[in-house]
């Protein structure tokens, strides 16, 4: 919405535009305005962005407003919150920047008969971007002086220059978000998409054969497994196999059958033939022995002289029987050739959780890190490691330890610094964390361990001459009385300086207002009003632009007027045959010096900026990325070192890119894992992970790598009539008219009539930027004076 | 005073159509999310819909994807479900419910209209 | 999907009893449980939301606790007008799914 708020209002003698008093009658002695002051109101009107202001035309923005809200002077700037001087336009389309704003104070009659008048018009034409931030403007020319501020603020969840932009936080199923003061999401940890409803999956998850509904999940398809779903299901029933692909059983070596259960190296699996045999693989899971001399049997296992090739290990003795032989083991050894280790951890005898290893006639205990001793049944002293950080003492526990922490420290090893910011930095104060402790960095304006004391500004009585101090958060105003100005009421108002006075007349400074002394031809409250001499005075014509008129304020007695027929931009030079010609101030052309010089036509604006036409100037609109006069200037967008984790920038226009070193990814080196964020593609555009890159894909309005670059598309062809410039603003344009033209696409002729330049019954016609007075009986001259 | 009213419900043959409504009222209808809930005769709750403010995303249970449509009309304050090949067990008491932005509870509830799928 | 599981289907208590009722979700869902009570014939209202919230206008004796997979609603002081039937609700992914839902009668 656009807001505007009436702040003061100066009409000392109580005039209204035209001269006249709004309360009836002068005073005959010093011919201030008797009887009531008056009732004014003011009425507001917002348009489209018009370098030269029409006060016609419908106010396409929006028109409003007050009640009556005071009398000649007033000073409402203390009276904040009250809404009687405050004007509110609301709109339901994109805020297009820039504007035009007119704004009339009046006096109402309080009458059915009588019409309101007019006391004062200001005009307004600019640019003003979405902000809590009001801007002051004056109106400081004319019978009336008054002081209004104006701001555009987007409605709640509405971001961007053209409070276009949507984004409501929110956490439940449609997605789990906050929205930065960009207006973009910024997703909750733990998701992820342009609508921050996809979960990430546990960091390793197969991007193929996983997926996940919730965060840090991660559930395999039909025939994958393992943490990370990147192990395939083999056959079922495989033993010797491995799979590729689900369902597999692919054969391990030597190995073979469907189910990889057939040993085809039976001989070298088993080593079957004993006492030096040779073995032959005969076919799956079959074998042969060839024994050596003194030998027999399938596995050669039957000894003719047994006893000769020392069949009992590890020094076991041997005894022949009809058998063969028979061994006697040494301790820790049994077996029929002592070469099988007696398992001594059956049973085990290690305690609490030990592992015990099996040694030769004996065993010995791998005790876990809390328990020590032969069969780990004494509890290990912990705190002989030093495990505590930041703790006062630590405590050995049965099968465990304590660490005492010291104020500010948590976590089994103190180690963990408690954050001490639970939110009691109030004012926007930022919170730092330390131990045991916090420290509110409070933003200007507030002290206070947790900044919530307004620092008094007043405290020091900074203002003069009886000026009274306003506290306000890190600044103070001072409201001063009548007769001084400037930020501490320290100048004495010269209501001289500048000079209201015109036509050359003497200006006479007051205590609280300043007096104009006119030359004869001249009155108003500034001189301003040419007297119609006219009625009472014959006039003759002298050239084709100057007319004599008798006056006694001459020494000849004798008073040349000239003519106006060459605007207000332009001077009469008289030609011979009753002809003139106009001589134009800089910047205007045309026979009544009517067109404004078009400064636009040598394309001064550069790198797509878009030319605006002023009196003898131009102003250029700049494409996203450039600033500067011409918009000559790339403006660096690597200035806030965008790029995280060693990464370099290379400025581009309007955008920035990031060179990536050690593996990091995405638009600012910022992830590990995917190179898109929701920050990497600018207005709405989405973005696709390409694997080393990423790329955007743009929504109508919008081009370039990261969609910031607003497509002249809007633009194209040329959507504004009669040499109207198109400014792009988004998906949308504005457009800026020539002179003589208005409206949002200036398809509508100003009325050049008004108002009322024609004099003594005169009708007006209206031309493009024109218009001609034709005269009543009697009388003649460009405005029928 | 938050008032959702349910209409369009009743008897319909199988393979036929129906289109529910929720009217609602007492709270900006263009600020929340909307939902369908239905509980067929002796038995839970069933989510059916979620439709976002907007309109933009929705949201569908499996048994009725394809058949149903969720929509809204923000300027008339209304919710729709549009039911097509309806089935014996679609028969149930469908509710309309809101939900705020955050946790995706559903704080309202109307008084639900009975939807009868029978030959 | 997120299957929820509640028990018991139902139990008998008399007023006064403190009741207890638990959902278990089939995989972590943080906070994003809500609780309802249904009595027969009307439309369900919300008395938890987010866990352990109680939601405006439910008096204070309902209360809900955990996270993550296990969650519970406890009823403190059982008043004549609790006995119905109390539904689970997960809110974070959808499909949204409601648990079977715990009748509590009067013993």
């Known amino acids: 919405q656009f807001e505007l708020e009436i702040l003061s209002m100066q009409n000392v003698n109580g005039e209204l535009q035209n001269g006249n008093c709004c309360g009836g009658a002068r005073n005959p002695g010093d011919r201030k305005c008797t009887r009531d002051e008056c009732d004014t109101y003011f009425k507001v009107c917002l348009k489209e962005y018009q370098s030269r202001v029409t006060a016609g035309g419908p106010c396409s923005f929006g028109s409003g407003s007050t009640p009556v809200i005071g009398g000649n002077t007033f000073n409402l700037k203390a009276s904040r919150g009250n809404d009687r001087n405050r004007i509110v336009l609301p709109f339901s389309f994109a805020w297009p920047r820039s504007y035009t704003l007119l704004v009339e104070a009046w006096d109402s009659s309080n009458d059915t008969v009588q019409p309101d008048s007019i006391i004062e018009k200001a005009s307004h034409s600019g640019m003003i971007n979405p902000s809590r931030q009001w801007q002051t403007l004056k109106q400081n020319t004319g019978v009336a002086h008054f002081e209004y501020q104006i701001r555009v603020t987007c409605d709640d969840y509405y971001y961007g220059f053209g409070c276009n932009k949507f984004c409501r936080p929110r956490d439940d199923f449609f997605g789990h978000y906050a929205c930065d003061q960009n207006g973009n999401k910024t997703c909750m940890e733990g998701w992820m998409g342009p609508e921050c409803n996809r979960a990430i999956c546990r960091q390793g998850c197969s991007p193929k054969h996983g997926s996940c509904k919730l965060p840090g999940d991660c559930r395999c398809q039909y025939g994958w497994q393992g943490l990370y779903c990147d192990k395939c299901i083999p056959h079922p029933g495989c033993v010797h196999g491995i799979c590729n692909e689900p369902w597999q059983c692919l054969c391990e070596t030597n190995w073979g059958g469907q189910l990889c259960d057939k040993d085809l190296n039976y001989c070298g699996t088993h080593q079957p033939c004993l006492n030096g045999g040779t073995c032959s693989n005969t076919g799956p899971d079959k074998y042969q022995c060839s024994c050596p001399e003194g030998y027999s049997g399938p596995n050669c296992e039957i000894a003719e002289h047994a006893c000769l090739s020392d069949p009992c290990h590890n020094r076991g003795s041997c005894k022949e029987t009809s058998l063969g032989f028979e061994c006697e083991c040494s301790p820790g050894w049994t077996g029929p050739t002592c070469s099988t280790n007696i398992d001594d951890c059956s049973p085990n005898n290690c305690s609490h959780g030990g592992t015990c290893q099996d040694l030769v006639n004996g065993f010995k205990c791998v005790c876990p890190p809390q328990w020590t001793g032969k069969t780990c049944q004494l509890d290990a002293n912990e705190c002989e490691a030093k495990p505590c950080v930041n703790a006062k003492s630590c405590k050995n526990l049965i099968a465990s330890y304590y660490c005492d922490c010291l104020p500010g420290w948590m976590g089994q090893n103190c180690d963990i610094n408690i954050n001490d910011c639970l939110g009691q930095c109030q004012n926007d104060a930022s919170c730092r964390d330390l131990v045991n402790g916090y420290r509110c960095i409070c933003p200007p304006g507030y002290a206070g361990d947790h900044c919530e004391r307004d620092i008094d500004e007043c405290a020091s009585n900074p203002c003069l001459n009886g000026g009274h101090c306003q506290n306000e958060i890190n600044r103070f105003q001072c409201l001063c009385p009548t007769g001084f100005s400037g930020n501490l009421c320290q100048l004495d108002i010269d209501y001289c300086e500048p000079n209201p006075c015109q036509n050359g007349a003497q200006c006479y400074n007051r205590a609280s207002d300043y007096f104009c002394k006119c030359p004869e031809d001249y009155e108003g409250k500034n001189c301003s009003h040419l007297k119609d001499h006219c009625r009472t005075t014959p006039c003759e014509v002298i050239d084709s632009c100057t007319v004599a008129m008798a006056s006694n304020d001459t020494p000849e007695g004798v008073r040349y007027i000239s003519s106006n027929v060459c605007g207000p931009h332009g001077k009469c030079k008289s030609q011979s045959g009753g002809k003139f010609t106009c001589d134009c101030n800089k910047g205007f052309t045309g026979t009544y010096c009517h067109e404004n010089i078009n400064d636009c036509e040598s394309n001064p604006c550069r790198n797509g900026g878009t030319c605006i036409d002023g009196v003898n100037s131009y102003k250029c609109i700049c494409s996203d990325g450039w600033e500067g006069a011409y918009c000559e200037t790339n403006i660096n967008d690597c200035s806030q070192n965008p790029c995280h984790n060693g990464g370099t920038c290379r400025d581009l226009v309007n955008d920035f890119y990031c060179d990536c070193k050690n593996g990091w990814k995405g638009k600012t080196c910022h992830s590990r894992d995917s190179q898109c964020d929701e920050a990497t593609c600018n207005n709405g555009g989405t973005c696709y992970d390409e694997g080393d890159a990423f790329k955007c894909m743009c929504p109508g309005g919008w081009e370039g790598t990261t969609c910031n670059i607003a497509r002249n598309s809007s633009c194209l062809p040329n959507p504004c009539h009669n040499g109207g410039t198109c400014v792009v603003n988004g998906e949308s344009f504005t457009c800026v008219c020539k002179e003589g033209w208005e409206g949002p696409i200036c398809a509508q002729n100003t009325n050049d009539c008004s108002p009322h330049p024609c004099y003594n019954s005169g009708t007006c016609v209206d031309g493009d930027n024109w218009y001609r007075c034709e005269c009543a009986p009697g009388f003649a001259g460009p405005d029928c004076r | 005073e938050v008032q959702l009213l349910e209409s369009g419900g009743g008897l319909v043959q199988p393979g036929g159509s129906l289109r529910l409504s929720c009217a609602a009222s007492g709270f900006t209808f263009s600020s929340y999310a909307m939902s369908w809930v239905r509980q067929a005769p002796g038995k839970g709750l069933e989510w059916v819909s979620s439709i976002e403010q907007m309109g933009w995303q929705t949201y569908y249970a499996d048994s009725v994807k394809g058949r149903f449509t969720i929509s809204r009309d923000n300027s008339k304050n209304t919710l729709y479900l549009q039911m097509n090949s309806l089935r014996a067990e679609d028969t149930a008491v469908y509710y309309c419910?809101?939900?705020?932005?955050?946790?995706?509870?559903?704080?309202?509830w109307g008084q639900g209209t009975l939807v009868t799928v029978s030959s | 999907d997120i299957q929820m599981t509640q028990s018991p289907s139902s139990l008998s208590a008399s007023v006064g009893d403190r009741v207890t009722i638990t959902c278990r979700a089939s995989q972590s869902i943080s906070s994003y449980l809500n609780w309802y009570q249904q009595k027969p014939g009307k439309a369900p209202k919300l008395l938890i939301y987010?866990?352990?919230s109680l939601q405006s206008g439910v008096p204070s004796r309902f209360s809900g606790s955990g996270s993550g997979t296990d969650f519970t609603l406890t009823i403190s002081s059982l008043q004549p007008e609790d006995f119905a039937t109390y539904y689970c609700q997960q809110s974070v992914v959808a499909p949204l799914t409601f648990g079977q839902g715990t009748k509590v009668e009067i013993k």
């Open positions: 987010a866990a352990s």
């Open positions: 419910a809101k939900s705020p932005p955050f946790f995706g509870q559903f704080d309202y």
